[in-house]
Amino acid sequence: PGPPPGPPRVSPDPRAELDSTVLLTRSLLADTRQLAAQLRDKFPADGDHNLDSLPTLAMSAGALGALQLPGVLTRLRADLLSYLRHVQWLRRAGGSSLKTLEPELGTLQARLDRLLRRLQLLMSRLALPQPPPDPPAPPLAPPSSAWGGIRAAHAILGGLHLTLDWAVRGLLLLKTRL
């Protein structure tokens, strides 16, 4: 009589998963842009701000063509995890000045967490190497002053914006290879 009927499709195809990951990344990029603008309005940035503990930008847009799927997803997940930790740290130790960025900062943290979960699921479905989602990391030192917290916020939101912009381009490119 032939094989029994198989199960219905229970979850999205990895390509559809990649589509929804791009949408989520775009939405997070818009949130970050808005929050960074809000921060600049309240506390104008005097030049570029850096934070040594932040990841360096993964890749220039021009070098995207040479990327392979595992490398992009692994690097993206590692960088976003670092930014998630920094956002958590900012909310916890950033001082009273940064309380004005709530609840938006909390929403950003939740969406970042959701994007990380989505990337983990995608890597699992593709059976790509999966480094630990929560590797142990040294604790971040609290800002030395209120202004230090504000400078850190500028650096974190600026870096996250660049990383997400890179992520959208990278994920769209990878979709053509899947």
Epitope: G6, P7, R9, V10, S11, D13, P14, R15, P70, R117, Q120, L121, S124, R125, L126, A127, L128, P129, Q130, P131, P132, P133, D134, P135, L178
Partner: antibody
Framework: EVQLLESGGGLVQPGGSLRLSCAAS????????MHWVRQAPGKGLEWVSV????????YYADSVKGRFTISRDNSKNTLYLQMNSLRAEDTAVYYC???????WGQGTLVTVSS | QSVLTQPPSASGTPGQRVTISCTGS?????????VHWYQQLPGTAPKLLIY???ERPSGVPDRFSGSKSGTSASLAISGLRSEDEADYYC???????????FGGGTKLTVL
């Protein structure tokens, strides 16, 4: 609808070889990592091996490392498991599964006995 | 000896709520990997019940829910029905094995 159909199981003597196949349909096979998972009679599930969507990454459980080889042919929508140096403890129903795994076949029985 | 630890059996009466636990270690659940749950009805292949700790695939009733905390996870079944009688397995990726690991399974009996 999704279908995974295993074949190639049967009775084999200790030290012998078998090649299992899994024919996939109803989904984009080349976009999914694929697993082999086994279940000894009356026992729980044991992961055996996984291969990435494009075949570039392959991992094995310690119990089968060096004896089993996983491979796939995306042009034929087929997954394979080459099993050599079979032992009595390899006796089990072998399932092929896709993704997390999200989808499972019905399994094929491999019996290793003299 | 399974890498993830589940109670071998659980039981409940129709309509009741039952919970099945799954305990791992720092190389799997504790490392942040997602937990997935499978249901295996007698004589059939396993079926995905919960993925990514608490997500339900389409077609799975909302009586089934999952959660994860630290190195443990749990599956809750509310409004227990006779057709829920099955074996339930948890699974998670393990970075020391480079593959998924399963719990030993929990046989659920509906009294």
């Amino acid at each position: 609808e999704v279908q995974l159909l295993e074949s190639g199981g049967g009775l084999v003597q200790p030290g012998g070889s078998l090649r299992l196949s899994c024919a996939a349909s109803g989904f984009t096979f080349s976009s999914y990592g694929m697993h082999w998972v086994r279940q000894a009679p009356g026992k729980g599930l044991e992961w055996v091996s996984v291969i990435s969507y494009d075949g570039s990454y392959k991992y094995y459980a310690d119990s089968v490392k060096g004896r089993f080889t996983i491979s796939r042919d995306n042009s034929k929508n087929t997954l394979y498991l080459q099993m050599n140096s079979l032992r009595a403890e390899d006796t089990a129903v072998y399932y092929c599964a896709a993704g997390v795994p999200d989808y499972w076949g019905q399994g094929t029985l491999v019996t290793v006995s003299s | 000896q399974s890498v993830l630890t589940q109670p071998p059996s659980a039981s409940g009466t129709p309509g009741q709520r039952v919970t099945i636990s799954c305990t791992g270690s720092s190389s799997n659940i504790g490392a942040g990997y997602d937990v997935h749950w499978y249901q295996q009805l007698p004589g059939t292949a396993p079926k995905l019940l919960i993925y990514s700790n608490n997500e339900r695939p389409s077609g799975v009733p909302d009586r089934f829910s999952g959660s994860k905390s630290g190195t443990s996870a749990s599956l809750a079944i509310s409004g227990l029905r006779s057709e829920d009688e099955a074996d339930y397995y948890c699974a998670a990726w393990d970075n020391s094995l480079n593959g998924p690991v399963f719990g030993g399974g929990t046989k659920l009996t509906v009294l």
